[in-house]
């Protein structure tokens, strides 16, 4: 199987985007890739959005999807926004070689992202 | 055990048209993925095409794309591979796949059923 690796840890910001690189080792020449973000929680896995692009080019999301992303050689920069507190969890990454021949799959590890809900502003006086 | 059994190939003229079908016993048919890979005589495995059952959204392989069809029937356990204006390059072992949870990668394959495309 391919090696994908992943940061352990990401901790969301206040306006509850979380951003991570994962890295891929291509055996191959890959021209068309795709990947998939899941969430595992409570051993349920679920996926979270999926992109496929050519090399070179941008990561093309479903238009109604919470991840942005681009591409620089075999890495990919993801950010998924929106999160909140209960969106906690392990994030996984998954890649895979499309084209040409043969097809590779990698899996990551995970990248555990925290998500704190901000504070409400309290009431002011003034 | 989940196994996956493959029919439907045969021989066609090009710019015929084939269905194949995956029928998969043993186990929970509510698999994240099942898709359709192919081999041709001194080639490498290659994907042909995949569908994923949370939105049961389809991905097609460019040199497929426009001819093949995948859907998946889950009253029947079943994921089919419609083949329409085949060409002598669509000449392979195709095998199904399937895989249990988006994490597991492609844990069952079937045995694979031949397409020959040829005049």
């Known amino acids: 199987a391919m090696h994908v690796a992943q940061p352990a840890v990401v901790l969301a910001n206040s306006r509850g985007t979380a951003s991570f690189v994962c890295e891929y080792a291509s055996p191959g020449k890959a021209t068309e890739v795709r990947v998939t973000v899941l969430r595992q929680a409570d051993s349920q896995v679920t996926e979270v959005c999926a992109a496929t692009y050519m090399m070179g080019n941008e990561l093309t999301f479903l238009d109604d999807s919470i991840c942005t992303g681009t591409s620089s050689g075999n890495q990919v920069n993801l950010t998924i926004q929106g999160l909140r507190a209960m969106d906690t969890g392990l994030y996984i990454c998954k890649v895979e070689l499309m084209y040409p021949p043969p097809y590779y799959m990698g899996i990551g590890n995970g990248t555990q992202i925290y998500v704190i809900d901000p504070e409400p502003c309290p009431d002011s006086d003034f | 055990e989940v196994q996956l059994v493959e029919s439907g190939g045969g021989v066609v003229q090009p710019g015929g048209s084939l269905r194949l079908s995956c029928a998969a016993s043993?186990?929970?048919?509510?698999?994240?993925?099942m898709g359709w890979f192919r081999q041709a005589p001194g080639k490498e495995r290659e994907f042909v095409a995949d569908i994923r059952t949370s939105a049961g959204r389809t991905y097609y392989a460019d040199s497929v794309k426009g001819r093949f069809t995948i859907s998946r029937d889950n009253s029947k356990n079943t994921v089919y591979l419609q083949m329409n204006s085949l060409r002598p390059e669509d000449t392979a072992l195709y095998y199904c796949?399937?895989?249990?949870?988006?994490?597991?990668?492609?844990?069952?394959w079937g045995q694979g059923t031949l397409v020959t495309v040829s005049s």
């Open positions: 043993g186990g929970t048919f509510s698999f994240y993925g």
């Open positions: 796949a399937a895989e249990p949870s988006g994490i597991s990668g492609w844990d069952y």
